[in-house]
């Protein structure tokens, strides 16, 4: 899986989208988890409604919400009031039994507000780009990690 980068601004909200094949994942609940270390487990943050037919209902855990468009095949995660500690590697998952398929690996980057430090909380709706050149920091965007890029900074 390539890793897609979503950039958001601290104190604002970020929407992460994870497209998937709606037929292949028909009837499956979805989840959003946080990767603990480069090879560590993925810790569940929030999952969609227990009843698959009600997956469109937003479910919250703290300030993170998940909602699933099961017909269109798009899982949407909202990180409301983004904070620096939200930065890191995450996964969108499709659940079946005790197993989980990875739909998308996501690197969330949190930027300082370049516009107005008094103004907390702008909603940015990320578009997606596949190259680093398109990753303009004045917008909340997403891109795929280039080959060789490391999602976790080296630790000493």
């Amino acid at each position: 899986h390539n890793t897609t980068v979503f950039q958001g601004v601290a104190g604002q909200s970020l929407q992460v989208s994870c497209p998937y094949d709606s037929m292949k994942h028909w009837g499956r609940r979805k989840a959003w988890c946080r990767q603990l270390g480069e090879k560590g487990p993925c810790q569940r943050v929030v999952s969609t409604h227990n009843l698959w037919l009600l997956s469109f209902l937003r479910r919250w855990n703290g300030s993170t919400a998940i909602t699933d468009d099961t017909l269109g095949g798009t899982l949407t995660i909202t990180l409301r009031n983004l904070q620096p500690h939200d930065a890191g590697l995450y996964q969108c998952q499709s659940l079946h039994g005790s197993e989980a398929d990875t739909l998308r690996k996501v690197l969330v980057e949190v930027l300082a507000d370049p516009l107005d430090h008094r103004d907390a909380g702008d909603l940015w709706f990320p578009g997606e780009s596949e190259s680093f050149e398109d990753a303009h920091v004045e917008h909340s965007i997403s891109r795929s990690l280039l080959e060789g890029e490391i999602p976790f900074p080296p630790t000493s």
Partner: antibody, heavy 124, light 107 residues
């Protein structure tokens, strides 16, 4: 059909604490943020703050030092406390749901359901 | 916070005529803007969200447009029940903020 109904004291003296509770009937309580909004007589609307079922809150900075919003998920209720009230806090207080759901475009954080409001008067 | 400014404060219009209400944001709110209608003694009612999408049950004579900092609510042919106060509100950031309102009255 989602309905909101609130109650609380309508007459207060300066320095007392305003206390209101809003009950949510029908729909999914856990899918939304729930807000308090007020309107002084003959004036415009002012957002006070919001909470979700997890207890996550956001407050208006102009009132933050005096406001506490709490939630009771077992009863599908959320409450507002505003301390040290003055005559300037005289207003109609509304509770509202934040999060209009559009089947095509998902959730929009507009206030789509309101209660009828409670008039709170602060008098000396 | 983002300041929302509505104009005019009062709009006098005859029934059947078109009414155009304006709302300006101090900074961009993208399309995260709603319009509400409020009649005396009642709670506000959501008319428009996402700057241009009508809420369920809102008549087609109400339309919204704009993005960024400039927004417009248009009532194509005013009916007697449309005379009220209209508020714009941004939900792009915290705190949520409303305009001061435009009163649409009978001319």
């Amino acid at each position: 059909q989602v309905q909101l109904q609130q109650w609380g004291a309508g007459l207060l003296k300066p320095s007392e604490t305003l206390s209101l509770t809003c009950a949510v009937y029908g729909g999914s309580f856990s899918s939304y943020y729930w807000s308090w909004i007020r309107q002084p007589p003959g004036k415009g609307l002012e957002w006070i703050g919001e909470i979700n079922h997890s207890g996550n809150t956001n407050y208006n900075p102009s009132l933050k030092s005096r406001v506490t919003i709490s939630v009771d998920t077992s009863k599908n209720q959320f409450s507002l406390k505003l301390s040290s009230v003055t005559a300037a806090d005289t207003a109609v207080y509304y509770c509202a749901r934040e999060g209009y759901y559009d089947i095509l475009t998902g959730y929009h954080d507009a206030f789509d359901i309101w209660d009828q409001g409670t008039m709170v008067t602060v008098f000396s | 916070e983002k300041v929302m400014t509505q104009s005019p404060a009062t709009l006098s219009v005859s029934p059947g005529e078109r009414a155009t209400l304006s709302c300006r944001a101090s900074q961009s709110v993208n399309n995260n803007l709603a319009w509400y209608q409020q009649k005396p003694g009642q709670a506000p009612r959501l008319l428009i969200y996402g700057a241009s999408t009508r809420a369920t049950g809102i008549p087609a004579r109400f339309s919204g447009s704009g993005s960024g900092t400039e927004f417009t609510l248009t009532i194509s042919s005013l009916q007697s029940e449309d005379f009220a106060v209209y508020y714009c509100q941004q939900y792009n950031n915290w705190p949520r903020t409303f305009g001061q309102g435009t009163k649409v009255e009978i001319k």
